[in-house]
């Protein structure tokens, strides 16, 4: 590989999953690589096989236990190694001391549903998935609504600076099809990032009531 081309980025979902991406320009696509996780204060260790996701990047998920089990805490440090096969031996290509609660990315919110819809308003709720109880209420959300004739990228972001698992969308157009997405982020962690966007929820506002004189 060419010097200065590698990247190794991992995130903890706050419960029992560490997702990693390894990229290396010039590496052969059929190179066999894996990520090995070795916690500093626990008896288990875990390995996952890196699978290609693009021309020069590979990804894998370290499954640490049952989805809702709390496998790591704020004091844990996990040594993560990228090992690639070179001939008959495995060679360490990258290594980092991973602090899980400094590198958080939660799962996308789930169970989006329309609670109530009117002509100009829609109340929507959702749930967070596999989020640690350690956060208590220290979470924030971003939401966006897709209007007809626009793209997701054009949709203005609505910020909820607290753990509020619902929103009331207002100033909507009657009898119009919309889509809605939400994502979540803990307040904790220097390198913490937003979750993926939720699956879009499609809804339609109610038609305006016809006037009595029509």
């Amino acid at each position: 590989a060419v010097n200065g081309t590698s990247q190794f980025t991992c995130f903890y979902n706050s419960r029992a999953n560490i997702s990693c991406v390894w990229s290396q320009d010039g590496a052969l696509q059929d190179t066999s690589c894996q990520v090995h996780a070795w916690p500093d204060r626990r008896r288990w260790n875990q390995t996952c096989e890196l699978l290609p996701v693009s021309q020069a990047s590979w990804a894998c998920n370290l499954i640490l236990g049952a989805p809702d089990s709390q496998k790591l805490t704020t004091v844990d440090i996990v040594t993560l190694r990228v090992l690639c096969r070179e001939g008959v031996r495995w060679r360490v290509m990258a290594i980092q001391d991973f602090k899980p609660f400094e590198n958080l990315r939660l799962m996308a919110p789930i169970s989006l549903q329309v609670v109530h819809v009117e002509t100009h308003r829609c109340n929507i709720s959702w749930e967070i998935s596999q989020a640690s109880h350690y956060f208590e209420r220290h979470l924030e959300f971003e939401a966006r609504t897709l209007s007809p004739g626009h793209t997701w990228e054009e949709a203005p972001l609505l910020t909820l600076k607290q753990k509020q698992e619902w929103i009331c969308l207002e100033t909507l157009t009657p009898d119009t099809q919309y889509e809605f997405q939400v994502r979540v982020k803990p307040l904790q962690g220097e390198f913490t990032t937003w979750s993926p966007w939720s699956q879009p929820l499609a809804f339609r506002t109610k038609p305006a009531a016809l006037g009595k004189d029509t």
Partner: nanobody
Framework: EVQLVESGGGLVQPGGSLRLSCAAS????????MSWVRQAPGKGLEWVGG????????IYQDSVEGRFTISRNNAKNTLYLQMNSLRSEDTAVYYC??????????????????RGQGTQVTVSS
């Protein structure tokens, strides 16, 4: 201002041992991977090995694996290089380097942001 000051170099016989130290200041030491590089007389810079920020992981160049050990004391902001079974080809100026992040990459051995002034190691009978 980042400062790295190496010490512990000297003259040693083949097969002997030496321990180098590097005192670091001016940055949050534990947040950065650190490496040792060396330069033999008339030759280019050669990577020796490195250690992650918390000191839990190391990577070595093949020629020193099993003979050299890199460690760190984050409470004292100090990096170490324990060199055993020294050979004449280990003769060089040894430099301590601060890497760009907490992650060490085998294919980025020279991607450091700071380097010390070096300490001379001479292996000779």
């Amino acid at each position: 201002e980042v400062q790295l000051v190496e010490s512990g170099g000297g003259l040693v016989q083949p097969g002997g041992s030496l321990r180098l130290s590097c005192a670091a200041s001016g940055f949050t030491f534990r947040n950065y991977a650190m490496s040792w590089v060396r330069q033999a007389p008339g030759k280019g810079l050669e990577w020796v090995g490195g250690i992650t920020g918390e000191g839990l992981g190391t990577i070595y160049q093949d020629s020193v694996e099993g003979r050299f050990t890199i460690s760190r004391n984050n409470a004292k902001n100090t990096l170490y290089l324990q060199m055993n079974s020294l050979r004449s080809e280990d003769t060089a100026v040894y430099y301590c380097t601060k890497m760009a992040s907490g992650t060490l990459f085998r294919d980025k051995p020279y991607e450091y942001t700071s380097r010390g002034q070096g300490t001379q190691v001479t292996v000779s009978s």
